[in-house]
C-alpha cells in the first residue's frame, strides 16, 4: 500500500485523522520538508531575541539579539551581553582587562599582549586594554652602526635654504 504522505509537500503535514490528506500547516507552524506527519511550531524570538526572519509555512523563524547583546551557539541559540573594548564578560558582569592583556572586541576574553622578545623584536608601540602591543625591529637592528635599509638624506650645502 503506497504511503500517500510522501506526496505532501513542504508547508503541509500528512493528516492521519483525515485519511492521509495533506493539510496546510496552521499559523505559527511550518514543515520544511515533504512527507511530514506534523508541523513544527515556529521559534519565538522574544526577550533578548529579535526576529531576523519571519516564520513561514516552509521555514522556521530566525532570531538575532537585541542591541547590546550578541549571538552565541548554532542558529543564535543564546544571546550574550556585549562589553566595551578593553573589557571581558565575567559572572559579575563586564570587567576591565588586567594589565598585560587586551580585548579589541565587544565580545570574548582579554588576551595577553604579544611578547615581542620571543620573536627577537622590540616593542614599538605599548599595549593598552583595547590594543595589542606593536612589535618593531629587533634591538640589534636599532644599535648604532647597524646598516639601515633607507639611505641617508643628502647633506645640504651651507648657505642654501631648502627649496
Amino acid at each position: 500500500l503506497q504511503d500517500l504522505c510522501s506526496n505532501c509537500p513542504a508547508g503541509t503535514f500528512c493528516d492521519n485523522n483525515r485519511s492521509q490528506i495533506c493539510s496546510p500547516c496552521p499559523p505559527n507552524s511550518f514543515s520544511s520538508a515533504g512527507g511530514q506527519r506534523t508541523c513544527d511550531i515556529c521559534r519565538q524570538c522574544k526577550g533578548v531575541f529579535k526576529t531576523r526572519k519571519e516564520c513561514s509555512s516552509t521555514s522556521n523563524a530566525e532570531c538575532d539579539c537585541i542591541s547590546g547583546y550578541h549571538c552565541l551557539g548554532a542558529e543564535c541559540s543564546m544571546c550574550e551581553q556585549d562589553c566595551k573594548q578593553g573589557q571581558e564578560l565575567t559572572k559579575k558582569g563586564c570587567k576591565d582587562c588586567c594589565f598585560g592583556t587586551f580585548n579589541d572586541q565587544k565580545r570574548g576574553i582579554c588576551r595577553p599582549w604579544t611578547n615581542c622578545s620571543l620573536d627577537g623584536k622590540s616593542v614599538l608601540v605599548n599595549g593598552t586594554k583595547e590594543r595589542d602591543v606593536v612589535c618593531g625591529p629587533s634591538p640589534a637592528d636599532l644599535s648604532p652602526g647597524a646598516s639601515s635599509a633607507t639611505p641617508p638624506a643628502p647633506a645640504r650645502e651651507p648657505g642654501h635654504s631648502p627649496q
Partner: nanobody, 126 residues
C-alpha cells in the same frame, strides 16, 4: 459529549464586519489550542487563526490586521471578529480544537484537528 457549535455567519457587504461565535461543550476552551479554519466554495481548508492556551494568537497572512481571535472563558466560547471583509473571505467558517505535542503552554508540533464544528457560512457580496 464534546461538541462545537458555530453561529454568526450571514450575508455582508464588502468592508463590513461580522463576529462569529463558537460555543464549546464537553471540554474547556481555555485549556486547549483552538482555531478557526475556512473553506471557500470549491477550495480546500484554509487556516485563519489560532489561539493557544496561554492566550497567544496567530493569523494567516490573508487576514492579519483584519480578523481577531478571542475567547470568553466564563462562557466557554471562542470568537472571530472579522472587519474590512472582502469578497475573497466568502467561505464556510469552522472552529476546531487542535492537537499539539508538547506540555503546557509550549507545544512543539501540531498534528491535526480533533474536533470540528458544523460550520457557519459567511458571504461577502454587494
Amino acid at each position: 459529549e464534546v461538541q462545537l457549535v458555530e453561529t454568526g455567519g450571514g450575508l455582508i457587504q464588502p468592508g463590513g464586519s461580522l463576529r462569529l461565535s463558537c460555543a464549546a461543550s464537553g471540554f474547556t476552551v481555555s485549556s486547549n489550542y483552538m482555531s478557526w479554519v475556512r473553506q471557500a466554495p470549491g477550495k480546500g481548508l484554509e487556516w485563519v487563526s489560532v489561539i493557544y492556551s496561554d492566550g497567544s494568537t496567530y493569523y494567516a497572512d490573508s487576514v492579519k490586521g483584519r480578523f481577531t481571535i478571542s475567547r470568553d472563558n466564563s462562557k466557554n466560547t471562542l470568537y472571530l471578529q472579522m472587519n474590512s471583509l472582502r469578497a475573497e473571505d466568502t467561505a464556510v467558517y469552522y472552529c476546531a480544537r487542535d492537537r499539539y505535542y508538547g506540555s503546557g503552554n509550549y507545544p512543539t508540533a501540531y498534528y491535526g484537528m480533533d474536533v470540528r464544528g458544523q460550520g457557519t457560512t459567511v458571504t461577502v457580496s454587494s
